[in-house]
């Protein structure tokens, strides 16, 4: 009885994320066989979120709003072992859209999510940013610097990368 | 004030080249991202590029990419625009102007006079 | 490319009556309560010249009797008493995403 209860949980869970997700891939946490995490296939996995890389070219705002849709936000960074996991998988010769931006024009960056934006850990390349047109940050490889962060404008189409909490049923 | 003033327009052969000028007075021009835009006799308005005001980020339509390049000279407070491979459809008044963020997107707020391209042979 | 569709594609209005000019964006240029769309006024033989931007936003200088509307997708011009100096062709743009791009205009003429 209590198999049966948690199994109709699990599939009314997963009957929520249907619509944006049709499949998702799941992994044992721990070692109770009750607790899975899920991200959507074929997102990838690092920690508690799953990241999803698009590929498709659009601004800032059509990035966060495509990210929205699918249950995310763009890409928040919160320490260096997160960013070190993210730019596996990402191509040296394409800019990635954070969901980091200062559309006041006041360098006062904020996170999408509200995160509070911490200078100490930030990873601009060196001399960024360095514009106040340029409101919406990305991430990009140098050769000089290897990967970091630039300021461009909002409106130039780049890739972006999107985060969401693993799903637990 | 505010002037902006274009030069460098002409008459040019399909396949020519010509560089346009515009030359800023009244703002602080290497604070400034600047634009071009274009308007083909009787039509409407066509964006055309934009570059940074530091001059490392360069943005074109489709319809000019790898024909034409946007540059500038902050210590001369000039916009240039290199126009190579032209077309016939490339006839147009050309604008240049400055660029004003707005939250996540911008305006185009003030304006030269223009100056005339026309390709014919 | 986001698609900027004016209509009408000209108008002709009495002196001190009211003008409208409707805009539609082939797709939403709305984030986060702001809408990136701006509107220009060209005289013959000038530059344009920016009167409203992000909608609804006068710019400065512009006489008020000039309004702008809108959100989403749909998006309007209003000059609400005519003045003989409004003679002019009216273009809205987006800036919502490059390319940007600009309706195909709009001329206003006394009738």
């Known amino acids: 009885n209590f198999m049966y209860s948690k199994t109709v949980k699990r599939l009314s869970k997963l009957r929520e994320y249907q619509q944006y997700h049709p499949s998702l891939t799941c992994v044992m946490e721990g070692k109770d066989i009750e607790d899975w995490s899920c991200c959507p296939t074929p997102w990838t996995s690092f920690q508690s979120s799953c990241y999803f890389i698009s590929t498709g070219m659009q601004s800032w705002t059509k990035s966060q709003k495509n990210c929205s849709v699918m249950g995310a936000d763009l890409v928040v960074i919160n320490t260096r072992e997160e960013q070190d996991f993210i730019i596996q998988n990402l191509k040296r010769n394409s800019s990635y859209f954070l969901g980091l931006s200062d559309p006041g024009g006041r360098r006062h960056w904020q996170w999408v999510d509200q995160t509070p934006y911490n200078e100490n850990v930030t990873f601009w390349h060196s001399g960024e940013p360095n514009n106040l047109d340029e409101r919406c940050a990305i991430i990009n490889f140098r050769s000089s610097e290897e990967w970091g962060w630039n300021d461009i404008h909002c409106h130039v189409p780049q890739k972006s990368i999107c985060k969401m909490k693993k799903i637990y049923i | 004030e505010v002037q902006l003033l274009e030069s460098g327009g002409g008459l040019v052969q399909p396949g020519g080249s010509l560089r346009l000028s515009c030359a800023a007075s009244?703002?602080?021009?290497?604070?400034?991202?600047m634009s071009w835009v274009r308007q083909a006799p009787g039509k409407g308005l066509e964006w055309v590029a934009t570059i940074n005001s530091g001059g490392d980020n360069t943005y074109y339509p489709d319809s000019v990419k790898g024909r034409f390049t946007i540059s500038r000279d902050n210590s001369k407070n000039t916009l240039y625009l290199q126009m190579n491979s032209l077309r016939a459809e490339d006839t147009a008044v050309y604008y240049c102007?400055?660029?004003?963020?707005?939250?996540?997107?911008?305006?185009?707020?003030?304006w030269g006079q223009g100056t005339t391209v026309t390709v014919s042979s | 490319d986001i698609v900027m569709t004016q209509s009408p594609d000209s108008l002709a209005v009495s002196l001190g009556e009211r003008a409208t000019i409707n805009c539609k964006a082939s797709q939403s240029v709305d984030y986060d309560g702001n809408s990136y769309v701006n509107w220009y006024q060209q005289k013959p033989g000038q530059p344009p010249k920016l009167l409203i931007y992000g909608a609804s936003n006068l710019e400065s200088g512009v006489p008020d009797r000039f309004s702008g509307s809108g959100s989403g997708t749909d998006f309007t011009l209003t000059i609400s008493s005519l003045q003989a100096e409004d003679v002019a062709v009216y273009y809205c743009q987006q800036s919502d995403e490059d390319p940007w791009t600009f309706g195909g205009g709009t001329k206003v003429e006394i009738k």
């Open positions: 102007a400055t660029y004003r963020p707005y939250y996540y997107g911008s305006v185009l707020d003030y």
């Open positions: 009244g703002i602080t021009f290497s604070t400034y991202t």
